[in-house]
């Protein structure tokens, strides 16, 4: 009975996500068969989040809308370890929007999910950000500095990275 009700709950939860994510990849968390964490297929997972590299080129606003439709946001990077995981899936000759912007042009950078902007946990390329007109952040590769962040014009189409919390069933 207990297992039956658990299965019913799982199925109803899966139906919630089916509209945007017809296929989920789930792994057992820890030793308890009861707890599964899932990411949409073919998203990648790291710690408690799922990531999707969008190769379509769109402006920052359209990229964020695109992530939002999938129940995600443009990526918020909280640690060096998280960035190191993300860059494994990026192409060196491309740039990718982050969920970081300065819409007022006053160098008040803000993350899309309202995570406080912490100057101590940023990975700007040297000399960046450097232009008040450039109000959106990308991550890209520079041969001298490897991967880092740069400010660019928000309306210039780029690839992007979406991030969502893992789905627990």
């Amino acid at each position: 009975n207990f297992m039956y009700s658990k299965t019913v709950k799982r199925l109803s939860k899966l139906r919630e996500y089916q509209q945007y994510h017809p296929s989920l990849t789930c792994v057992m968390e820890g030793k308890d068969i009861e707890d599964w964490s899932c990411c949409p297929t073919p998203w990648t997972s790291f710690q408690s989040s799922c990531y999707f590299i969008s190769t379509g080129m769109q402006s920052w606003t359209k990229s964020q809308k695109n992530c939002s439709v999938m129940g995600a946001d443009l990526v918020v990077i909280n640690t060096r370890e998280e960035q190191d995981f993300i860059i494994q899936n990026l192409k060196r000759n491309s740039s990718y929007f982050l969920g970081l912007s300065d819409p007022g042009g006053r160098r008040h950078w803000q993350w899309v999910d309202q995570t406080p902007y912490n100057e101590n946990v940023t990975f700007w390329h040297s000399g960046e950000p450097n232009n008040l007109d450039e109000r959106c952040a990308i991550i890209n590769f520079r041969s001298s500095e490897e991967w880092g962040w740069n400010d660019i014009h928000c309306h210039v189409p780029q690839k992007s990275i979406c991030k969502m919390k893992k789905i627990y069933i």
Partner: antibody
Framework: EVQLLESGGGLVQPGGSLRLSCAAS????????MSWVRQAPGKGLEWVAT????????YYPDSVKGRFTISRDNSKNTLYLQMNSLRAEDTAVYYC??????????????WGQGTTVTVSS | DIVMTQSPDSLAVSLGERATINCKAS??????????VNWYQQKPGQPPKLLIY???NLESGIPDRFSGSGSGTDFTLTISSLQAEDVAVYYC?????????FGGGTKVEIK
Amino acid sequence: EVQLLESGGGLVQPGGSLRLSCAASGITFSTYTMSWVRQAPGKGLEWVATINSGGDNTYYPDSVKGRFTISRDNSKNTLYLQMNSLRAEDTAVYYCATYRPYYYGSVLDYWGQGTTVTVSS
Amino acid sequence: DIVMTQSPDSLAVSLGERATINCKASQSVDYDGNSYVNWYQQKPGQPPKLLIYGASNLESGIPDRFSGSGSGTDFTLTISSLQAEDVAVYYCQQSDEDPWTFGGGTKVEIK
């Protein structure tokens, strides 16, 4: 008073090259993102190129990508548009304009009087 | 690319009467409460002049008989009381995503 003065237009044969200039005064030129916009005879407006204030980021529509190059010399308060492999459809009045950000978008707030480019054999 | 479609192509209005120009974007140009549509006026032999930005914000120095409205994909420029000096071609433009694109223009004349 903001002034933008374009020059360098003229008659050129198909396949030829031309370099347009835009001399700016009345603004702190080195802090402005700048754009070129063109207007074919009797037609509407078409964005051609944009360059950021430092000159390290440039953007073009597909119609001119690989043929046109926007650049700037902040010490001379001057914007340039190098146009190569010109075609008849590039015939237009070319305007330079200052770019002003608006949240995630922008506006073109000051415009020059334009310089005419005619591509014809 | 985002296509901006203006209507009508031309408009004849009596002095002192209202003129309304429409602009339709092929996809939404809104984000976070702002619309990325601008309106420009171009008189014969002159460069374009910015009138309205962000769909409804009047540019400094522009008479308040000009107003803009709309959101999403549908936008309107209104001249509440047409003056002789308003004879011009009016263009809408989106700045949400490159390439920036303009409407085909609406010619406003006096009836």
